[in-house]
């Protein structure tokens, strides 16, 4: 789960042992240097894709290894009580619709996987997130123009879902409904905030399977 | 090795139509902004038009506004600029480039180019 | 649409002098969130297809000799040759990527004196 101190660390691909070993024999040759992290990941790619299959089966085999360890700690692991009880979704809920930057990553994220094969899902993010930080104003707002339209038609489906799932309704006080609306309205938030890190798991997950096709 | 290369260009008399295809190699093509930009003869560099990498957002210059097509097919690894009502001011060799989408924005790999004429 | 306007239109410079181009745009191309300016440097010999040098106004693209430089912020910038080649003979065009349209200023020839 998120933040649990005592969960496995995440088994390792072979491309990221090599990074690894990059960045160590980087700052071994060049200690007060800083790193610059898109030309460095260049480099390093570009060495990976020119090295042999016996060059590289010294990082598979630190791979399997990992494997292996993340596999051991993982049967042992217990996650913390009350995470592996999701609260019930509804499925033929509408969909919360997806934000400007996850747009634009579902865009780019091909490009980041063939040029990195291997990266780790959170070095993907990282590279995703630069990219992000680098696209300027005037290249944001397609994404952005997108975004609120999708936001704007889940909140139009989601007012039509609750009304629907809720006839009742109307026949309760209208004073009543206006005192606990902002209650409702924060309640709502925390859900948003919730459904949209259940959304970023799911992408996640999907993303590992990917990997594991690659 | 990275490379474009584009190819469809040719003589075209004055409100004909032209389509242009540049093949992409060596690198994800679908993860990438691809560009068109022209040159006519002895005058310096004009932006066309731009695809993003799924092909779902375009944009074109002023003067081919409404008579060119930007399109790709990712799964050709192509880009495609589809000329109609050509003038003769449309002459020009017309280069594909990458645009360093989300990285940085110039254009870093180039075609060789094609050339339009427009003449009757 | 943002222009680009570059000076001189054309320059000769001695072999092994410094040999510096202008660039100047209507609007700053410097984008406040990350502190960093759209503007890029190209080099395009005859008949061949422009090559990119310099991207970020500073930044030398991988396998671009030393000797070329870019510097500036906001709307005005410069790229300089240090020890102009015979190689570097060349039209060079600067371009911002800030906004759509992506503009080009209308060139600059190097030539040897």
């Known amino acids: 789960g998120k933040g649990d101190p005592k969960k496995p660390r995440g088994k390792m691909s072979s491309y990221a042992f090599f990074v690894q070993t990059c960045r160590e024999e980087h700052k071994k040759k060049h200690p007060d240097a800083s790193v610059n992290f898109s030309e460095f990941s260049k480099k390093c790619s570009e060495r990976w894709k020119t090295m042999s299959a016996k060059e590289k089966g010294k990082f598979e085999d630190m791979a399997k290894a990992d494997k292996a360890r993340y596999e051991r700690e993982m049967k042992t692991y217990i996650p913390p009580k009350g995470e592996t009880k999701k609260k019930f979704k509804d499925p033929n809920a509408p969909k919360r619709p997806p934000s400007a930057f996850f747009l634009f990553c579902s865009e780019y994220r091909p490009k980041i996987k063939g040029e990195h094969p291997g990266l780790s899902i959170g070095d993907v993010a990282k590279k995703l997130g630069e990219m992000w930080n680098n696209t300027a104003a005037d290249d944001k707002q397609p994404y952005e123009k997108k975004a609120a339209k999708l936001k704007e038609k889940y909140e139009k489906d989601i007012a039509a879902y609750r009304a629907k799932g809720k006839p009742d309704a109307a026949k309760k006080g209208v004073v009543k409904a206006e005192k606990s609306k902002k209650k409702k309205e924060e309640e709502e938030d925390e859900e948003d905030e919730e459904d949209e890190e259940e959304e970023e798991d799911e992408e996640d997950e999907e993303e590992e399977e990917d990997d594991d096709d690659e | 090795e990275v490379q474009l290369l584009e190819s469809g260009g040719g003589l075209v008399q004055p409100g004909g139509s032209l389509r242009l295809s540049c093949a992409a190699s060596?690198?994800?093509?679908?993860?990438?902004?691809m560009v068109w930009v022209r040159q006519a003869p002895g005058k310096g560099l004009e932006w066309v038009s731009r695809?993003?990498?799924?092909?779902?957002?375009?944009g074109y210059a002023d003067s081919v506004k409404g008579r060119f097509t930007i399109s790709r097919d990712n799964s050709k690894n192509t880009l495609y600029l589809q000329m109609n009502s050509l003038r003769a001011e449309d002459t020009a060799v017309y280069y594909c480039?990458?645009?360093?989408?989300?990285?940085?924005?110039?254009?870093?790999?180039w075609g060789q180019g094609t050339m339009v004429t427009v003449s009757s | 649409d943002i222009q680009m306007t570059q000076s001189p239109d054309s320059l000769a410079v001695s072999l092994g002098e410094r040999a510096t181009i202008n660039c100047k745009s209507s609007?700053?191309?410097?984008?406040?969130?990350?502190?960093?300016?759209?503007l890029a440097w190209y080099q395009q010999k005859p008949g061949q297809p422009p090559k990119l040098l310099i991207y970020w106004a500073s930044t030398r693209e991988s396998g671009v000799p030393d000797r070329f430089s870019g510097s500036g912020s906001g709307t005005d910038f410069t790229l300089t040759i240090s020890s102009l080649q015979a190689e570097d003979v060349a039209v060079y065009y600067c371009?911002?990527?800030?906004?759509?349209?992506?503009?080009f200023g209308q060139g600059t020839k190097v030539e040897i004196k």
């Open positions: 695809i993003s990498p799924s092909g779902g957002q375009t």
């Open positions: 371009q911002q990527y800030y906004s759509t349209p992506r503009t």
């Open positions: 480039a990458r645009e360093e989408g989300g990285s940085y924005g110039a254009f870093d790999i």
């Open positions: 609007q700053s191309v410097l984008y406040s969130s990350n502190n960093k300016n759209y």
């Open positions: 060596g690198f994800t093509f679908s993860g990438y902004m």
